[in-house]
Amino acid sequence: ESALITQQDLAPQQRAAPQQKRSSPSEGLCPPGHHISEDGRDCISCKYGQDYSTHWNDLLFCLRCTRCDSGEVELSPCTTTRNTVCQCEEGTFREEDSPEMCRKCRTGCPRGMVKVGDCTPWSDIECVHKESGTKHSGEVPAVEETVTSSPGTPASPCSLSG
């Protein structure tokens, strides 16, 4: 019994060659930016700006690039190895409980409260009670994995063991 495959297990020449249209799968898998052919013999490049794959895979198709919605700005475009990164426009934020839409930030705090945090693309303004300093229940915490991190070409979402 052995651990599941990681990028490091694969031959260096298989790790990525964006300029190549086709390469051979390694242990049945294709590198980020590619998908496997129907006959399993080739790795086919994703189409820049149309589709992508971020991980080693045996997908028959690359994943479709996300299109930013109205009310969003494109922080970085879709490449063959990374999906589009969209961010809410200024004055709006994406709530963790409803990530599919940007919501307007509040313009001010309720009476008796003071603003301690600004509107960001991932959180509403933060209000606390003047006296106690406790947060207003309407406050939305910032998302941990912010949109600025660059994934590179990861092998797997986490280390797996058999």
Epitope: I5, G28, P157
Partner: antibody, heavy 121, light 111 residues
Amino acid sequence: EVQLVESGGGLVQPGGSLRLSCAASGLPFNSYYMSWVRQAPGKGLELVAAINSNGGRIHYPDTVKGRFTISRDNAKNSLYLQMNSLRAEDTAVYYCTRLTYYGNPAWFAYWGQGTLVTVSS
Amino acid sequence: DIVLTQSPDSLAVSLGERATINCRASESVDIYGNSFMHWYQQKPGQPPKLLIYLSSNLESGVPDRFSGSGSRTDFTLTISSLQAEDVAVYYCQQSYEDPLTFGGGTKVEIK
């Protein structure tokens, strides 16, 4: 069209053994991860074993580790599950599946019709 | 292990109405802009069938009345206009972490 056909299920006593087979067609079998998923009567789904395209990488959950063995014969387009030391809680329909890989074994793209294994005295 | 909790356990929806199924993970299943959550449909006496992969990607051949959304720990499968053939049990499944785990299922019936 992808077809996965399981066989080998049946009634077995606790402590007994059984070998399940899965015949695959309509896909380049030697290119893909394969797996066995089971479903106890009226219950949910559980991954039992997974194997990569050349058989070099294998995974079992703790519930079956040391008792079940997954293997494949790419020349015969066949997947196997050897089940030893069977227990009443292993009673389930066992499905042969084609497991898509995306960064790690990820989702179950194709399923066979399943074969019923009953462990009872 | 990541535990997936589906809600409700069952729901009855009128034909043509919207059905919404939720799946909550015990920890985030997001990384590198991907949500490692997938959805299946299982009709009585049949094996499960893949509907949605990576939270929102519709599997080839699946009607577009099915859609998936969500991120991190909270995910939703929506059937925009329920049809008679959609009566089934629906399961979520995560592949962020070993072992791969499934939710307990949500039974969808016609009201």
